[in-house]
Interface confidence: medium
């Protein structure tokens, strides 16, 4: 009931709580002397459902039969209307429409850890829309029954707050949940289980790893578990991997030897536990242990390449380059590289440890036969040395690969192709494709890149350290024993017209012709490999088309003669540069007047 109901009553039959689809009778009746003054026949009783008028009647009472009420709560209010006055609230009632509880389904219980508490969950079924009380009962050995009630609106979980003990792990427990509301009750099917069925061990803790004699092959994982644990499963993986290695162990008693770990690798380890071979469930995975395995001496051999540069009649510069070992080959932190240089006939040798670099440059006599050996060392030892005999890599003309071409292949890739050398192609033991950014000064500090290709290959895709709009000098070497032949080409992965033209820095007169000198276009403005320069000239103040001379681009060329100018005529000259994508804008303009005699 709502409000004070001083003036009258609202009664509901059969009940304030009804089953969905039922009919209710609502009666509103006035108490004595609570009607309208003067004429009681003027009493007009009105029944509202929420704010909507559903019935009215003149007199002291009103009866209304109501059907089709929705699930939930519906409010009915009775009001009195008298002539020349506002409606007066008499009384009201709430009617609760719902359903009897369905049978709770899938009752299951779990105890987290040997010291945890028993908690059960179930599925309530459809909402009753009424206050429904759930009672969970657990019957166990020694004729004991625990009972807990739940007063939440949506109750599907209860924790007894008690701890089952493993005195008789095979003893049976039976759980049952009963739902009760005003319209009925329903009990779940009983769920019968043993201690071993429902206890889910706590995850293992205090995980440690030990490497005996700092060796990856003698590794033991240790952990702590609850007392009754029989089974463990271990999973481990390199930290950068998504795939786990799994191991199942029985009666491990908190330790297990791992035999297949890789050296110098960070691993993640986790462990889970179970109390019984067939019964119960696995614990959650433990917190991860992350640990790095010890180093082992490097395997594999360094990939070594070199460059020779003529200094003078008696000396040459040797630059050695090598690539880092892969992580799996290095098997540790490379502390230094050992380079040994030896003159093969005289037996003179020098050894040097290089740290922090993967290159080494020295000057040696041009005479004698020289060899180098390079190896990588970590804390456990050194890799096998890579030995190379220093030779003139381009000396054997007949070994030079033919028809070398370089074409752009997608973003930041260049496809290099060639034909085998004229000399017996079967003599080739391997090809080496080398590339470096083209710098007009032939700068030896520019990083060198290379890859090796099998003797039956006639193409290679180069992608390492390739940038768009940069020109690369590409060489293909054919190696055969202690001989080598090479061919070179320029190539770029992406090009466009140069951003500027060459800057003319001088024009000089020589025997009736002129020599034009210019500064190279800065590398970052070349926008790829230059193919040609163009020199333009025309008479000053003339509207005629300029004449031009096109010069094939050569890296070292910075001047060119022109002999078709008329004496004592002032000319304007400028230059442009071209890539395969087009021509640059003009460089600077210079005026010049040839002083020589007229013909």
């Amino acid at each position: 009931k709502i409000d004070a109901c001083k003036r009258g009553d609202v009664t509901v039959k059969p009940s304030h709580v009804i089953l969905l689809g039922s009919t209710v009778n609502i009666t509103c009746s006035l108490k004595p002397r609570q009607g309208c003054f003067h004429y009681s026949r003027r009493n007009k009783l009105i029944l509202y459902k929420f704010d909507r008028r559903i019935n009215f009647h003149h007199g002291h009472s009103l009866n209304s039969q109501v059907t089709g009420l929705p699930l939930g709560t519906t409010l009915f209010v009775c009001k009195l209307a008298c002539i020349n006055s506002d409606e007066i609230q008499i009384c009201g009632a709430e009617i609760f429409v719902g359903v009897a509880p369905e049978q709770p389904q899938n009752l299951s219980c779990i105890q987290k850890g040997e010291q945890g508490t028993v908690a059960c969950t179930w599925e309530r079924g459809r909402d009753t829309h009424l206050y429904t009380e759930y009672t969970l009962q657990l019957s166990g050995p020694k004729n004991l029954t625990w009972q807990k009630q739940c007063k939440d609106i949506y109750c599907d979980y209860l924790d007894f707050g008690i701890n089952l003990t493993p005195e008789s792990p095979e003893s049976n427990f039976t759980a049952k949940v009963t739902a009760v509301n005003s319209l009925g009750s329903s009990s779940s099917l009983p769920s019968t289980f043993t201690f071993l069925d429902i206890v889910r061990p706590l995850p293992p803790w205090d995980i440690r790893i030990k490497f005996q004699k700092a060796s990856v092959s003698r590794c033991t994982l240790y952990w702590r578990d609850e007392g009754l644990v029989l089974l463990n499963r271990l999973r481990y993986r390199p930290s950068n991997s998504r795939l786990w290695n799994m191991v199942n162990v029985t009666k491990a008693k908190g330790r297990h030897d791992l035999l297949d770990l890789k050296p110098f690798t960070e691993y993640e380890f986790q462990i889970s536990s179970k109390l019984h071979l067939y019964k119960g469930s696995w614990s959650d995975w433990s917190e991860s242990l992350r640990a790095q395995t010890p180093e082992e001496e490097p395997t594999g051999m360094l990939d070594v390449w070199y460059m020779k540069r003529h200094i003078d009649y008696s000396r040459q510069q040797i630059s050695l380059f090598w690539k880092n070992l892969s992580v799996s080959e290095a098997r540790g932190k490379i502390l230094h590289y050992q380079v040994t240089l030896q003159e093969l006939t005289g037996g003179k040798a020098m050894t040097q440890n290089i740290t922090g670099h993967t290159s080494w440059t020295t000057v040696i006599p041009r005479t004698g036969n020289w060899a180098v050996a390079v190896s990588a060392a970590n804390s456990k030892g050194s890799s096998l040395p890579t030995r190379i005999n220093i030779m003139n890599l381009c000396e054997a003309g007949l070994l030079a690969p033919r028809q070398v071409s370089a074409n752009s292949e997608g973003m930041d890739n260049i496809l290099v192709t060639w034909q085998p050398p004229r000399k017996d192609p079967s003599a080739v033991q391997e090809y080496v494709v080398e590339w470096r950014e083209l710098h007009p000064g032939g700068d030896t500090q520019v990083p060198l890149n290379w890859l090796r290709s099998r003797p039956y290959n006639v193409s290679a895709l180069i992608s390492e350290n390739i940038k768009s709009y940069i020109c690369y000098e590409i060489r293909v070497y054919a190696l055969s024993g202690d001989q080598g032949g090479c061919s070179s080409i320029l190539g770029n992965s992406k090009h466009k017209a140069p951003l500027s033209g060459p800057h003319i820095n001088a024009i000089t007169e020589e025997k009736g012709s002129i020599l034009i000198s210019w500064n190279s276009i800065p590398v970052q403005e070349q926008m790829g490999c230059l193919l040609h320069y163009r020199i333009y000239w025309k008479e000053r103040d003339s509207n005629s088309q300029p004449q031009l001379c096109e010069i094939p681009y050569r890296v070292s060329q910075n001047s060119h003669p022109i002999n078709s100018l008329q004496p004592r005529v002032t000319y304007v000259l400028w230059m442009t540069a071209l890539t395969a994508a087009g021509e640059s804008s003009h460089g600077n303009e210079r005026e010049f007047c040839l002083q020589g005699k007229a013909n």
Epitope: G116, T117, L144, W146, K151, G161, I162, N163, L164
Partner: nanobody, 129 residues
Framework: EVQLVESGGGLVQAGGSLKLSCAAS????????MGWFRQAPGKEREFVAA????????VYVDSVKGRFTVSRDNAKNTVYLQMNSLKPEDAAVYYC??????????????????????WGQGTQVTVSS
């Protein structure tokens, strides 16, 4: 130190009812599980019923289930045992006990004497046939 005093025992006919009370003092009552045990002459002390700290979990021995109801009033520091349909075999000295507090690593079923730290002096219940 918790002191427990039982009351409400007496002589009753078979089929009758009694309500035992146990008043606690000297501790934080709401932090203890409370239990009832009984001991008949010449027999071991036997667990009867218990109620957990919050009052919504109860446990009964099967022989009294449906006849006895354990309840508590934390505001009054009192635990009750309502005994209906009493039988001659229910006759015994009834003891009230306060269980040791739950910690993160210690839970209990509260059905064994060793789960309880404090005990009352007992109250006699006699059932005549």
């Amino acid at each position: 130190e918790v002191q427990l005093v039982e009351s409400g025992g007496g002589l009753v006919q078979a089929g009758g009812s009694l309500k035992l009370s146990c008043a606690a003092s000297g501790g934080t009552f709401s932090s203890y599980a409370m239990g009832w045990f009984r001991q008949a002459p010449g027999k071991e002390r036997e667990f009867v019923a218990a109620i957990m700290r919050s009052g919504d979990t109860t446990v009964y021995v099967d022989s009294v289930k449906g006849r006895f109801t354990v309840s508590r009033d934390n505001a009054k520091n009192t635990v009750y045992l309502q005994m209906n349909s009493l039988k001659p075999e229910d006759a015994a000295v009834y003891y009230c006990a306060a269980g040791r507090p739950v910690t993160r690593t210690y839970y209990s079923t509260y059905t064994y004497p060793h789960d309880y730290d404090y005990w009352g002096q007992g109250t006699q219940v006699t059932v005549s046939s």
